[in-house]
């Protein structure tokens, strides 16, 4: 039985194979039970976590994970060497940077060691599964009497990222947001000196080096206006 899994991470072509064994007419054998879906995320291209819901198993089972890269020099099957655990049951695998090849098709196989024919294989495009670290070192600069410029840094990925800036004043009920390309810089042309502004930024591995849908965590917010701007309009500290 071949089942295509539609995942929310840009890997719609992932295919999972479920293997059936012969079974009595009155009950399903354990090998017909679907295995949990594996979800992988590459964190800042430093390490990758592939996890599954271990509690979906009818009884606690230490599922095993193997992986390889399709049609490449790295197509040798590898065993997971660093399992993640949930209540002493395997629930994921962590791969280190040297084991990550973003632009090759990553094949991950989950297996029930007690029922070797009960296994599921998924193919993933890792360049669509990168989640960068949150932007850091937010700074504000006054360009003119009414214009502010927000700058920030990203660890390591730089031009591969796009960004989303959100800002609001203490008078606003919701955030205003603005997309920013790889230049990691944002200008607010019209600032009301009587209001206190809050800014925050998040980043995504898209569109130049990959097509990820998941954003980083939000940065720590930075504030401008009211008391802080009166004390020193050219020095703005990062506030957690």
């Amino acid at each position: 039985l071949n089942t295509t899994i539609l995942t929310p991470n840009g890997n719609e072509d992932a295919t999972t194979d479920f293997f059936l064994t012969s079974m009595p007419t009155d009950s399903l054998s354990v090998s017909t039970l679907p295995l949990p879906e594996v979800q992988c995320f590459v964190f800042n291209v430093e390490y990758m976590n592939c996890t599954w819901n271990s509690s979906s198993e009818p009884q606690p089972t230490n599922l095993t994970l193997h992986y390889w890269y399709k049609n490449s020099d790295n197509d040798k099957v590898q065993k997971c060497s660093h399992y993640l655990f949930s209540e002493e049951i395997t629930s994921g695998c962590q791969l280190q940077k040297k084991e990550i090849h973003l632009y090759q098709t990553f094949v991950v196989q989950l297996q029930d060691p007690r029922e070797p024919r009960r296994q599921a294989t998924q193919m993933l495009k890792l360049q669509n599964l990168v989640i960068p670290w949150a932007p850091e070192n937010l700074t504000l600069r006054k360009l003119s009497e009414s214009q502010l410029e927000l700058n920030w840094n990203n660890r390591f990925l730089n031009h591969c990222l796009e960004h989303l800036v959100q800002y609001r004043t203490d008078w606003d009920h919701s955030w205003t947001e603005q997309s920013v390309d790889y230049r990691h810089k944002f200008s607010l042309p019209s600032v009301d000196g009587q209001k206190r502004y809050t800014f925050r930024v998040r980043s995504r591995f898209n569109p130049l080096c990959g097509s990820a849908q998941h954003w980083s965590e939000w940065s720590h917010p930075i504030h401008w206006g009211s008391n802080s701007s009166k004390e020193n309009p050219f020095l703005f500290a990062l506030e957690a």
């Epitope: 291209v45 890269y69 490449s72 020099d73 790295n74 940077k97 040297k98 990550i100 090849h101 973003l102 632009y103 090759q104 098709t105 495009k125 360049q127 031009h159 591969c160 569109p207 130049l208 080096c209």
Partner: nanobody, 127 residues
Amino acid sequence: QVQLQESGGGSVQAGGSLRLSCVASGYTFSSYCMGWFRQAPGKEREGVAALGGGSTYYADSVKGRFTISQDNAKNTLYLQMNSLKPEDTAMYYCAAAWVACLEFGGSWYDLARYKHWGQGTQVTVSS
């Protein structure tokens, strides 16, 4: 808007030479990877050569016969093909990446590394 336009393909006898060109607009050459790929009828697209960050890379089948180079002033990538063989017959494509040729693991010829592709130029080598 990045655009890649190949030229220089054609028909040639075995042992002959051709020089392919790829003009890039909206893309600045730097340490990012640019490559030549080819696809013969009924076969998968394969890497021929790539260049980036001062390094060049070649498929084993073309080493010593093909040379990849670039002219930054003209924003053009070249592929000089000498001692052509009938098995070199294919559509040749120019491709541009926004990462270095070996960045983030893998190989220079991983297709997914390249974000932009030209339309291709046909090379036919007859015996």
